[in-house]
């Protein structure tokens, strides 16, 4: 009778992480009597999937009835496959000996790969925000995904970005993989509403992209551009002075009035209007009585916005020697304004 | 969480004998191959012996015919038997777990043998 | 019996610098190359195998590259948690399992 020979007619197998994997396995001959057992890998560090004597495989199902006497099927199914499981796997016949059975035949082995799909992607933007013109890096990582082709993209509000790098990991053979891409973006007044998104695609997604998205409202400052403007004296030695912050992003904001130099008042931006790009502005009034000095009055609206160094506008007023000679309506007079910073 | 825990190291004199014992826990130990792997004081890691998920036994030319590797399935306790011990057999002794890819991904935090007169 | 090299002996680095570790076989080993981290009073600890797989928990600063003969670890940049001994060790043969001489880095 011809020698009995292991086949493993499946030289791969390709299993989707999460399901169970069938590994075929059968004999040509009932003789020599002795087990089956399947292991992973070949050399001496191999590992025992399944021993048809004894052992516990909780994951492992055999196909047939290894206890009929005629059974050649020794095929097993795995369940639960993760990419961890990945390798080639042997049947071997066992010849019954004693006291221990020996190594009688190998299958020429089954490779078994995993298909897993990415994790959702994680989009990451700077520590610190930036203003306007700037330009910012976002990252984009995604992990535990095989087989390692994987395409990445970016966009913002829509449009493709083209100026990113990427990085699959690692370079060699692996049960998994991630990716690693790191995106330049150049920001702009108009990117409170924006949003950066990292679109992912992998054969395991079957065409619908993962996509992990970063708002630029987290990443982007917009400083304020102030004015200060003189209104109609409102009684005849007050003279009504306000200070226009506009188009500023986040909303944290202080404003100082300064006499003179001299502190006059401190207030905190709270009862803000909202623009359509998603900047605010912010209005505040000092009312200053002419007749309390005696010299020309520079009156200045210092903003501090966001923990930045603050940014002020200056206005003079000039208090004049005989306010009943000029008439109600120019008791102060502007005399120009300028801004600066305070360091 | 896999744990290796080696036991058995001494001081010895050339010639004698001592047995290391190591237990694992935390994996099927029946699974998997073991392997014992030493270090001198201030060299490198130099394998020692496995063995086998079907144990078959494999050993280091340095220890060949003197050391002998065993496991107890029932146990989880790999051992390995050092007889006509000598100077240079002076180093820790670790256990380690085998992957199927001859890597040994698990240490145990070793025994320590000195062999000296 | 594949004998393993590493060069160099010990390299001395500042926080935050690229680290860059030799390993050459007297044969060729394909890809089977490993990777181990060892600080003092510790058994070694996985690193990479397979020449550029980073072996569970190990964080993205490692990586491995090469193939045949020559090989390299990179840590990108140096964390005082680094300083160690690292070793190599082929995983193609069978036994004799062999592992390289080791290089130690040192964190300024």
């Known amino acids: 009778e011809e020698e009995l020979q292991v086949i493993q007619p499946d030289k791969s197998v390709l299993v989707a992480a999460g399901e169970t994997a069938t590994l075929r396995c059968t004999a040509t001959s009932l003789i020599p009597v002795g087990p089956i057992q399947w292991f992973r890998g070949a050399g001496p560090g191999r590992e025992l999937i399944y021993n048809q004597k004894e052992g516990h495989f909780p994951r492992v199902t055999t196909v047939s009835d290894l206890t009929k006497r005629n059974n050649m099927d020794f095929s097993i199914r795995i369940g639960n496959i993760t990419p961890a499981d990945a390798g080639t796997y042997y049947c071997v016949k066992f010849r019954k000996g004693s006291p221990d059975d020996v190594e009688f035949k190998s299958g020429a082995g089954t490779e078994l790969s995993v298909r897993a799909k990415p994790s959702a992607p994680v989009v990451s933007g700077p520590a610190a925000r930036a203003t306007p013109q700037h330009t910012v890096s976002f990252t984009c990582e995604s992990h535990g995904f095989s087989p390692r082709d994987i395409t990445l993209k970016w966009f913002k509000n829509g449009n493709e970005l083209s100026d990113f790098q990427t990085n699959v990991d690692p370079v060699g053979e692996s049960v998994s993989y991630s990716i690693h891409s790191t995106a330049k973006v150049v920001l702009t007044r108009e990117d409170v509403h924006s949003q950066v998104i990292c679109e992912v695609a992998h054969v395991t997604l079957q065409g619908d992209p993962l996509r992990g998205t970063a708002n630029l409202s987290e990443t982007i400052r917009v400083p304020p551009t102030l004015e200060v403007t003189q209104q109609p004296v409102r009684a005849e030695n007050q003279v009504n002075v306000t200070c226009q912050v506009r188009k500023f992003y986040p909303q944290r904001l202080q404003l100082t009035w300064l006499e003179n130099g001299n502190v006059s008042r401190t207030e905190t931006a709270s009862t803000v209007t909202e623009n359509k790009d998603g900047t605010y502005n912010w209005m505040s009034w000092l009312l200053v009585n002419v007749s309390a000095h005696r010299d020309d009055v520079k009156l200045t609206c210092q903003v501090e916005h966001d923990g930045q160094p603050a940014v002020s506008k200056s206005h003079d007023l000039k208090v004049s020697a005989h306010p009943k000679e000029q008439g109600s309506n120019t008791a102060a007079e502007n005399t120009g304004s300028n801004e600066r910073n305070i360091y | 969480d896999v744990q290796l825990v080696e036991s058995g190291g001494g001081v010895v004199r050339p010639g004698e004998s001592l047995r290391l014992s190591c237990a694992a826990s935390g994996f099927t130990f029946s699974n998997f191959a073991m392997t014992w792997v030493r270090q001198a004081p201030g060299k490198g890691p130099e394998w020692v012996s496995l063995v086998s998920v079907t144990a078959t036994t494999y050993y280091a030319d340095s220890v060949k015919g003197r050391f002998t590797i065993s496991r107890d399935n029932s146990k989880s306790t790999l051992y390995l038997q050092m007889n006509s011990l000598r100077a240079e057999d002076t180093a820790v002794y670790y256990c380690?777990?085998?992957?199927?890819?001859?890597?040994?991904?698990?240490w145990g935090l070793g025994t320590l043998v000195t062999v000296s007169s | 019996e594949i004998v393993l090299t590493q060069s160099p002996g010990t390299l001395s680095l500042s926080p935050g610098e690229r680290a860059t570790l030799s390993c050459r076989a007297s044969q060729t080993v394909g890809s089977k190359l490993a990777w181990y981290q060892q600080k003092p009073g510790q058994a070694p600890r996985l690193l990479i195998y397979?020449?550029?797989s980073r072996a569970s928990g190990i964080p993205d600063r490692f990586s491995g590259s090469g193939s045949g003969t020559d090989f390299t670890l990179t840590i990108s940049s140096l964390q005082s948690e680094d300083s160690a001994v690292y070793y190599c060790?082929?995983?193609?043969?069978?036994?004799?399992?062999?592992f390289g001489g080791g290089t130690k880095v040192e964190i300024k």
């Open positions: 060790q082929q995983h193609n043969d069978w036994p004799p399992y062999t």
């Open positions: 397979d020449s550029s």
């Open positions: 380690a777990k085998i992957t199927w890819n001859n890597l040994f991904d698990y």
